[in-house]
């Protein structure tokens, strides 16, 4: 039950995270005009990964796409790439995790296959989240660098007479959306990986010994939760010595690579 809950919650958290990463990638407000300590402008400039916009005081908003590819800064291209990779990995992860959900039955899919798929999707979500966090952080670092550079020469004088006000940009809403979304996707991925451990059928290498007291047979089965869950299963008993001590091995034990995650 706990495994199903963990897996389901991981899926939902990752779904919200990936939706947030997509939203952040599409948003125009990655960087917004810094209004603090600046001349009060009748326009508000803001920029996204794909276009820059200007909102005039009348409310009229005009956006222009970056129609060049080669002319864009390498950092912006890198951020775009990271966000797209994050979205693609996240989307594939979602697709895989749907089939891996314990509550969904697809034919006679074994638990080991579901565990495999859960782990795969979990890793994809973790990488997706890291890509988004990295992309947003690279952009934020770029903004901070440019902010202090433009603060250093806020007014670039031309012959001491005419001044050009340099527009400074600060963090836009998309950065915060991206950070939160990336974090959620990461958390969701970790939850999927945790759920995978619970889903994986374990090979029981425990030897359970039965001690026969005089008159009745009382069995003691060491080995923790996993070994004791098969109390209704078929067991084969091997006689070791006449004193009545017997070893019990579970019949339904499959070796699994997830035993020691």
């Amino acid at each position: 039950m706990a495994v199903t809950a963990c897996q389901g919650l991981g899926f939902v958290v990752s779904l919200i995270g990936i939706a947030g990463i997509i939203a952040a990638t599409c948003m125009d407000q990655w960087s917004t005009q810094d209004l603090y300590n600046n001349p009060v402008t009748a326009v508000f400039n803001y920029q996204g990964l794909w276009r820059s916009c200007v909102r005039e005081s009348s409310g009229f908003t005009e956006c222009r796409g970056y129609f060049t590819l080669l002319g864009l800064p390498a950092m912006l291209q890198a951020v775009r790439a990271l966000m797209i990779v994050g979205i693609v990995l996240g989307a594939i992860g979602l697709l895989v995790s749907i089939f891996a959900l314990k509550c969904i039955r697809i034919g006679s899919m074994e638990d080991s296959a579901k565990a495999n798929m859960t782990l795969t999707s979990g890793i994809m979500f973790i990488v997706s989240g890291l890509c988004a966090i990295a992309g947003v952080s690279v952009f934020a670092n770029m903004l901070v660098t440019n902010f202090w550079m433009s603060t250093a020469n806020m007014y670039t004088g031309m012959g001491g007479m005419v001044q050009t006000v340099q527009t400074r940009y600060t963090f836009g809403a998309a950065l915060f959306v991206g950070w939160v979304a990336g974090g959620l996707t990461l958390i969701g991925g970790v939850m999927m990986c945790i759920a995978c451990r619970g889903l994986a059928p374990e090979e029981t290498n425990y030897k359970a010994v039965s001690y026969h007291a005089s008159g009745h047979s009382v069995a003691y089965k060491p080995g923790g939760f996993k070994a004791s869950t098969g109390f209704g299963s078929n067991t084969k008993n091997k006689k070791i010595y006449d004193g009545g001590a017997r070893t019990e091995d579970e019949v339904q034990s499959y070796p699994s690579k997830h035993d020691y995650v």
Epitope: P39, N45, S58
Partner: antibody, heavy 120, light 113 residues
């Protein structure tokens, strides 16, 4: 047809107060920012204040801040300019003007103006 | 505040001749975000309110005759009346539309020679 009609001007003593009104018609008033601009007799134009469609933000020319207050009532399609502690140099024709949409913040329609005379 | 300096203060031009008015701003009116200039030109005839002629430094307002044209970028702008008509006698103002307060130039009075 867009129409802006100012009213409330007149003769007022120095230190006195006056409230100007601007009645708007012919357009969706609640969707547009509005300006007040004044013009002293025989002089040039001087921008006074701006109020956005939703009453925030509001901007004033520095020298009039604290004495002049701009407000609007979208339900009544009306713009107001409350003027206090009036001085002789506030004597001017006061115009209300609409902040045009998609005209790079220019003032696309103006009223005929109302004359305010501050004199003892 | 942005200072808008217009020149000349007055201009006398023969009918059908070209009239040119200059406007200089103390700071660039070119917005980097959209590479547009935020400068407007107004015409004010005696006893009338101002009328918008040009916005964005070079775009004519609808209904304005094509003899009026605006040019320039950054800090230097020009209003040109290609062939002066009698009805063009007025005072012309430039205005900064990028920074608050939205300052006006001192005005240029255009008369018939």
């Amino acid at each position: 047809e867009v129409q802006l009609v100012e009213s409330g001007g007149g003769l007022v003593q120095p230190g006195g107060s006056l409230r100007l009104s601007c009645a708007a018609s012919g357009f969706t008033f609640s969707s547009f920012g509005m300006h007040w601009v004044r013009q002293a007799p025989g002089k040039g134009l001087e921008w006074v204040a701006y109020i956005s469609s939703g009453s925030s933000p509001i901007y004033y020319v520095d020298k009039l801040k604290g004495r002049f207050t701009v407000s609007r009532d979208n339900a009544k399609n009306s713009l107001y300019l409350q003027m206090t502690s009036l001085r002789a140099e506030d004597t001017a024709v006061y115009y209300c003007a609409r902040a045009g949409y998609a005209v790079r913040n220019a003032l696309d329609y103006w009223g005929q103006g109302t004359l305010v005379t501050v004199s003892s | 505040d942005i200072v808008m300096t217009q020149s000349p203060d007055s201009l006398a031009v023969s009918l059908g001749e070209r009239a040119t008015i200059n406007c200089k701003s103390s700071q660039s009116l070119l917005n980097v975000g959209n590479q547009k200039n935020y400068l407007a030109w107004y015409q004010q005839k005696p006893g009338q309110p101002p009328k918008l002629l040009i916005y964005g430094a070079s775009t004519r307002e609808s209904g304005v005759p094509d003899r009026f044209s605006g040019s320039g970028s950054g800090t230097d702008f020009t209003l040109t009346i290609s062939s002066l008509q009698a009805e063009d006698v007025a005072v012309y103002y430039c205005q900064n539309d990028l920074f608050y307060p939205l300052t006006f130039g001192g005005g240029t009075k255009v008369e018939i020679k």
